[in-house]
């Protein structure tokens, strides 16, 4: 068409997909009467009439725009609804009078792509591949026009680099006219890239300006051979017998090699393989002093049959041996002295403490306990505690019982027991002394003796309450080589006036405390005797 080259540049109208484009016919009054205008769409240089304006009234032409066009602004503006990517073209309005003039509008359509979806290569990448390998794929769906992709590694943009970095992008057009972009990042990675964070960024334009969307960050599995193997022990710090100890083999390769953990046999000096659990961890539970020694880890790279050895690691399981006390079973006369000596072995320096068993009172800090002017009350338990101050919880103890020679000592001298006639009494009597006494009763009945400890005895007597017994009472006598001693039990008949308010049973129970370091009791229990058979 002659003179077409002098046409002014079309007016640019930018709009997002799905919204309404307002196409304002920019003809001046001198160029044409806006009450008589034809609208055309231009696609591949072919004009198609899409809308007529006559006397200010609009009429759509049949075709793709038939349902989406309307007049606005007293006929000066054509509104195109539900814009699609296919609407990106030139629209022109042509005035008919006074002479044929036209005004061109370039419609630009935009659509932000969806969030980019990044997929890492699940198979991973070996470090010494000869050419770039696929690291990840980035997909940006439904954008218009085609967005630009930028790949990042650790926050820095990646550039194409021969034999090192290659970015391969392609796009497909959806039926909607929108574009889906796929970009594959290929790279040659090094061992240090095992923790590298990769992501892709889509850059796109909207009427409001330039925008971008970032994918999530991903790391790619990087495979590299093991160069170093080492052992790690948990817990860290001083170990003691009884602890749960884990020895694990670690390597700087990926995937980890096949491991074995060995301990050096101290006598043969051979490395003997230890049995590890399914995770390749050697668990010592409970740890014993025999677990101390030299451990090492061997790793095999089965791809090359290369075997690697860790530096040996010395493991020390600290211990305290059984505690020995001498003399082991001390016996002393009243008024004499005694020296108790405590011994133990340990992998560390030991501290000793002597405690009184009954009270937990600390008597001495050190391995030797000296006792002077021994009284009967000094008899009983003494505990030696051997502990390692630098390792809390590492200690062993040994109890020794001191016996003081002396005649029997009764738990009580005398006491009252409430009874009923014809009941079977269960009487008990306790005595202590060294040598341990024996107990006898002054009445007939069923007696049984029970040793409470090396110096203490408890005798129990079952006896029927008779009028004679009520009169005489019961005596128990304890005797040993050094003398004898007696306790008396007075029997008192129960009647309604002697029953206490809370006595709702026919059993009266009486307890007496007599010994300075033992508790003793005497009980009476009623048992009804069978009634005589009635004779007919």
């Amino acid at each position: 068409v002659p003179g077409e080259a002098e046409q002014p540049a079309p007016e640019l109208v930018e709009v997002e997909v799905g919204s309404t484009a307002l196409l304002k016919c920019g003809l001046s009054q001198s160029q044409g009467n806006l009450s008589h205008v034809d609208w055309f769409s231009v696609h591949k240089e072919k004009r198609t009439l899409i809308f007529r304006v006559r006397q200010g009234q609009g009429q759509s032409e049949p075709g793709e725009y038939e349902q989406r066009l309307s007049l606005q602004d007293r006929g000066a503006t054509l509104a195109l609804t539900q814009v699609t990517p296919q609407d990106e073209r030139i629209f022109l309005c042509q005035g008919k009078r006074p002479r044929s003039q036209e005004y061109r509008i370039q419609l630009r359509v935009y659509k932000a792509p969806e969030e980019p979806n990044i997929q890492v290569n699940p198979l991973g990448i070996p470090v010494n591949s000869k050419e770039p390998e696929e690291v990840a794929t980035c997909v940006g769906r439904n954008g218009y026009p085609i967005p630009q992709v930028i790949w990042y590694k650790n926050g820095r943009p990646l550039k194409e680099e021969k034999n090192r970095v290659h970015i391969q992008s392609s796009q497909t057009v959806e039926s909607s006219g929108l574009y889906t972009l796929q970009s594959i990042l290929k790279a040659q990675l090094v061992k240090e890239d095992k923790d590298a964070q990769f992501y892709c960024e889509l850059n796109y334009r909207l009427p409001s300006g330039n925008h971008m969307k970032e994918s999530r960050e991903v790391t790619v599995p990087v495979f590299y051979p093991t160069e170093k193997v080492w052992l790690e022990v948990e817990p860290v710090g001083m170990l003691k017998e009884g602890d749960r100890v884990e020895i694990r083999c670690l390597a700087d390769g990926n995937p980890p090699p096949h491991f074995s953990i060995s301990k050096q046999n101290p006598s043969t000096r051979e490395a003997e393989e230890e049995t590890t659990n399914d995770n390749g961890v050697l668990v010592l539970e409970p740890a014993r002093k025999e677990h101390s020694g030299r451990y090492e880890c061997q790793a095999w790279n089965l791809d090359t049959m290369i075997s690697l050895l860790s530096e040996p690691q010395e493991l020390l399981v600290n211990y305290v041996s059984d505690v020995r006390v001498s003399p082991a079973a001390p016996e002393r006369q009243e008024g004499s002295s005694l020296t108790l000596t405590c011994e133990a072995e340990s992998s560390q320096d030991l501290e000793f403490q002597w405690l009184r068993e009954e009270t937990d009172q600390v008597l001495e800090r050190g391995p030797v306990l000296q006792l002077h002017d021994l009284k009967r009350e000094a008899g009983g338990g003494y505990r030696c505690v051997a502990s390692v101050p630098s390792i809390p919880g590492l200690n062993r103890t040994q109890l020794v019982k001191l016996a003081i020679f002396g005649p029997p000592w009764m738990a009580f001298k005398e006491r009252k027991v409430w009874v009923k006639e014809n009941m079977v009494l269960n009487l008990s009597c306790e005595a202590s002394g060294h040598p341990r006494p024996t107990i006898s009763w002054n009445v007939n009945g069923t007696a049984s003796e029970q040793d409470q400890d090396p110096q203490r005895v408890l005798s129990t007597l079952n006896v029927l309450v008779t009028p004679e017994l009520l009169e005489t009472g019961v005596e128990c006598t304890a005797s040993n080589d050094l003398g004898k001693n007696t306790s008396i039990l007075f029997l008192e008949l129960v009647n309604l006036t002697t029953l206490t308010p809370d006595s709702n049973t026919t059993t009266g129970l009486s307890t007496s405390t007599a010994s300075p370091h033992t508790r003793a009791n005497s009980t009476s229990t009623e048992r009804k005797l069978p009634e005589p058979e009635s004779r007919g």
Partner: antibody, heavy 120, light 112 residues
């Protein structure tokens, strides 16, 4: 018959580079672990590098780590040793070797060797 | 690193005589689980490349004459040629593969 033929040796100045090649035939090259072993003028043998059958795993002793690179092209049945920052102590006869299918690292087959001399 | 020490460094033996070469490792090469030692022996005849003789300390490579035998365990190993033949003149090397790979310095066998 297993055949390993080394090439690429020669005289090179200290600090220089050299690339050795080993052409393999008579076996399925891509199935075997390959290594380079060198022999010094004093007749000492020293392992130099090992590569897995697929080429993804490589190993070196500390004496050459970071200076030598072993690689392979299974399509061409060829093993390579790229040597850089060469030192006089790298002077040796370099042998290309093939492992065997034992559960232990052995150099079952050896080439005839190629001589590398590092000297100014 | 594991150091391999061979002794003697050379020896001259009459044909038909027994030859014993020792190899000592700076640490045990025994894998206690499989009860095998990571030790191999190689032979290098004059002007030739080395050749594998024995692996696992005592297993002969196929084609190796039975006059060659390997023994020992842990740190001390021996290569024995029961009756020296003229074609056995060579340098013999031991090699460990317990931790990476190291060779002994070699033992030269000559005919007296």
């Amino acid at each position: 018959e297993v055949k390993l033929v080394e090439s690429g040796g020669g005289l090179v100045q200290p600090g220089g580079s050299l690339r050795l090649s080993c052409a393999a035939s008579g076996f399925t090259f891509s199935s075997y672990i390959m290594s380079w072993v060198r022999q010094t003028p004093e007749k000492r043998l020293e392992w130099v590098a090992t590569i897995s059958s697929g080429g993804s795993s490589t190993y070196y002793p500390d004496s050459v780590k970071g200076r030598f690179t072993i690689s392979r092209d299974n399509a061409k049945n060829t093993l390579y040793l790229q040597m850089s920052s060469l030192k006089s102590e790298d002077t040796a006869m370099y042998y290309c070797t093939r492992d065997d299918d034992y559960d232990v690292k052995v150099f079952a087959y050896w080439g005839q060797g190629t001589l590398v001399t590092v000297s100014s | 690193d594991i150091v391999m020490t061979q002794s003697p460094s050379s020896l001259a033996v009459s044909l038909g005589e027994r030859v014993t070469i020792n190899c000592k490792s700076s640490r045990s090469l025994l894998n206690s689980r499989i009860r095998k030692n990571y030790l191999a022996w190689y032979q290098q005849k004059p002007g030739q490349s080395p050749k594998l003789l024995i692996y696992w300390a005592s297993t002969r490579e196929s084609g190796v004459p039975d006059r060659f035998s390997g023994s020992g365990s842990g740190t001390d190993f021996t290569l024995t040629i029961s009756s020296l033949q003229a074609e056995d003149v060579a340098v013999y090397y031991c090699k460990q593969s317990y931790n990476l790979l190291t060779f002994g310095q070699g033992t030269k066998v000559e005919i007296k």
